[in-house]
């Protein structure tokens, strides 16, 4: 029986050009994870191994950091890269537990910012 | 340049155990994972599993669990690959082969070992 | 575990012809898929990684395409060296697994 849950930092934004750390957390079971698969829709991420440790898929290699821990950075984001976003975490005994996040990337407001500033 | 040279054939009897040898040469060798993938003559490849020098940290494929057990010495970048209770099927080609860097594909194999067991 | 099933087993063409091979994963693998080639007597070596990238120095005449569960591996132009056994390996999910290969010959 599976009794784990995955918590996950849910909806959150983030400015184009910018970076984000994608996290879930599987609790309560004392399943062992195996590993973890980051998925964009139907695209593959990257895959972090308990032993093995990162693969990075090279179509996100340039954009794609490991960690922190299981977690996945995106770095130089784009408007395209606004959607829905798994980590599929694969336990043994139990099986298979998948979190969701969605990630909205906001056009960059560094222009707005950098009037509120003057240097005198 | 990189190198992985595996030991020479062997010769066992069913019920007993061998090991086989993967020294590396030319690149970093705690800084990628090393798995072992054999080959039944004429046959398909089989991965048997993969550890991480650096942790020692191992993944088996769970037909082997129990019967491989996988092994490093960091101190001459070799790798060890041991098979107990042999039977007659296990009578292949065990390779040694090394992963690109972040990425799970084999890029530098052994050349081979062959392991025969006979009664 | 995942079953990569690949066809045809074996295959007979002439030189400069295009060949095709295929490969299908029991459930979705993405693109976690790579080809290899292995001469007689040889080790396997790697062609193409994550469906579809050319592994440094292969020639531009092997290619891949696929994802989720059917995969193409391509010949465009079958050369004498050609003469190999290919294989389809997926790395999705552990225990990695091989199709059962295919082998060129040339007529």
């Known amino acids: 029986m599976m009794t784990g849950t995955i918590e996950t930092t849910g909806n959150i934004s983030a400015e184009k050009g910018g970076s984000i750390i994608l996290q879930c957390h599987l609790s309560s079971t004392t399943a062992q994870v195996t590993q973890v698969n980051w998925e964009q829709q139907d695209q593959l991420l990257a895959i972090c191994n308990a032993d093995l440790g990162w693969h990075i898929s090279p179509s996100f290699k340039d954009r794609v950091a490991p960690g922190p821990g299981l977690g996945l950075t995106l770095q130089s984001l784009t408007v395209n890269d606004t959607g829905e976003y798994f980590c599929i975490y694969h336990t043994y005994p139990d099986g298979t537990y998948t979190g969701r996040i969605f990630l909205e990337v906001l056009e960059s407001s560094v222009a707005e910012h950098g009037a509120r500033f003057q240097i005198p | 340049q990189v190198q992985l040279v595996q030991s020479g054939a062997e010769v066992k009897k069913p019920g007993a155990s061998v090991k086989v040898s993967c020294k590396t040469s030319g690149y970093a060798f705690t800084e990628y994972t090393m798995h072992w993938v054999r080959q039944a003559p004429g046959k398909g490849l089989e991965w048997m599993g993969g550890i991480n020098p650096n942790t020692g940290g191992t993944t088996y494929n769970q037909k082997f669990q129990g019967r491989v057990t996988l092994t490093v010495d960091k101190s001459s970048s070799t790798a060890y690959m041991e098979l107990s209770s042999l039977r007659s099927e296990d009578t292949v080609v065990y390779y040694c082969?090394?992963?690109?860097?972040?990425?799970?594909?084999?890029?530098?194999w052994g050349q081979g070992t062959l392991v025969t067991v006979s009664s | 575990d995942i079953q990569m099933t690949q066809s045809p087993s074996s295959l007979s063409a002439s030189v400069g012809d295009r060949v095709t091979i295929t490969c299908q994963a029991s459930?979705?693998?993405?693109?976690?898929v790579a080809w290899y080639q292995q001469k007689p007597g040889k080790a396997p070596k790697l062609l193409i990684y994550?469906?579809?990238y050319r592994y440094t120095g292969v020639p531009s005449r092997f290619s891949g395409s696929g994802s989720g569960t059917d995969f193409t591996f391509t010949i465009s132009s079958l050369q004498p060296e050609d003469i190999a056994t290919y294989y389809c390996h997926q790395h999705y999910i552990t225990p990695w697994t091989f199709g059962g290969g295919t082998k060129v010959e040339i007529k």
């Open positions: 082969a090394k992963l690109l860097r972040l990425m799970y594909y084999f890029d530098y």
């Open positions: 994550s469906a579809s």
């Open positions: 459930q979705d693998v993405r693109t976690a």
